[in-house]
């Protein structure tokens, strides 16, 4: 009789030691459950205010028509910039028209005065053609202007409102180029 | 944190096509700039070619009009397609993420072209 009491308290006890990690894993679960709607409002959150706030252009970058520009607070050599502007999600600038050349002069005298600015033109050390960094050949009219006198690799920039070519390895201001993103109201 | 890695490279004669691949785990590469760089014995890694979350792409001068590199955000992977191989183009070819917090590498692969 004694054993049969032993046996059923054991029982009991066993029941109530799963009960107890039954809740435990309930109270876990109830946490974890209130941490996940808490990441999921704070994330709708920040997806709606940034749907709200979606302006064709990151902060301090310029738009004019399709494209967004950063203007470099810093120097740099022509390669480290285009990895600067790769970091953002962007390449040097790629100017297609005159039109936008006279864009990017006339913000650069507005913002800064007569720096030099890399922008993605380089040239070619076997055949002497200017090429842009998606392979294109820059129109007739925005050639650099002068040849610069370098046994090592040259690339383009902006001065003022002139293209003119340096030795890749100098240091200057750069500019990045990306799309602005298309309103979707 | 994304994994990368690479695929595609191997012994090519000169003349000849390669395509390589940057697949990438643990999280979408839509979002990111992938660049392929390469490390030729003795010499500095250098960028070979990057492609921008929006599609920009930026080539080195060695390489344009011969090398196209290209995106599948399907398939979270970026493309270096090689073409018109050269003797000079050996070297470990690496893709790399870029974002403006942090950049991340994947392992390499060999492309060895004979002539």
């Known amino acids: 009789k004694l054993l049969q009491v032993s046996t059923i308290a054991m029982q009991q006890q066993e029941k109530l030691i799963q009960q107890e990690r039954a809740l435990l894993n309930f109270t876990e679960w109830k946490r974890s459950c209130a941490l996940q709607m808490k990441y999921c409002q704070a994330f709708m959150q920040n997806s709606l205010s940034s749907a709200h706030n979606s302006s064709p252009c990151p902060n301090n970058w310029i738009q004019n028509r399709e494209s967004c520009y950063y203007v470099s607070e810093i120097w740099s050599i022509w390669h480290t910039s285009q990895e600067n502007c790769l970091k953002e999600g962007s390449t040097l600038l790629q100017i297609e028209s005159k039109e936008e050349m006279d864009f990017i002069t006339g913000s650069l005298r507005k913002i800064k005065g007569s720096y030099d600015y890399w922008v993605g033109l380089s040239q070619d050390g076997h055949s002497g053609r200017w090429l842009w960094q998606d392979g294109s050949s820059p129109s007739p009219g925005l050639l650099p202007a002068e040849r610069s006198q370098s046994a090592n690799q040259v690339c383009g920039y902006v001065k003022s409102n002139s293209l003119l070519s340096s030795n890749c390895s100098t240091w200057k201001y750069f500019i990045c180029e990306k799309y602005a993103l298309r309103s979707s109201v | 944190q994304v994994q990368l890695q690479e695929s595609g490279g191997g012994l090519v004669q000169a003349g000849g096509s390669l395509r390589l691949s940057c697949a990438a785990s643990?999280?979408?590469?839509?979002?990111?700039?992938i660049g392929w760089y390469r490390q030729a014995p003795g010499k500095q890694r250098e960028l070979v070619a990057a492609?921008?979350?929006?599609?920009?792409?930026t080539y080195a001068d060695s390489v344009k009009g011969r090398f196209t590199i290209s995106r599948d955000n399907a398939k979270n992977t970026v493309y270096l397609q090689m073409d018109s191989l050269k003797s000079e183009d050996t070297a470990v070819y690496y893709c790399?993420?870029?974002?403006?917090?942090?950049?991340?590498w994947g392992q390499g692969t060999q492309v060895t072209v004979s002539s």
């Open positions: 790399k993420g870029f974002s403006p917090t942090d950049d991340f």
């Open positions: 643990g999280r979408t590469l839509s979002s990111y700039t």
């Open positions: 492609i921008t979350n929006q599609g920009r792409r």
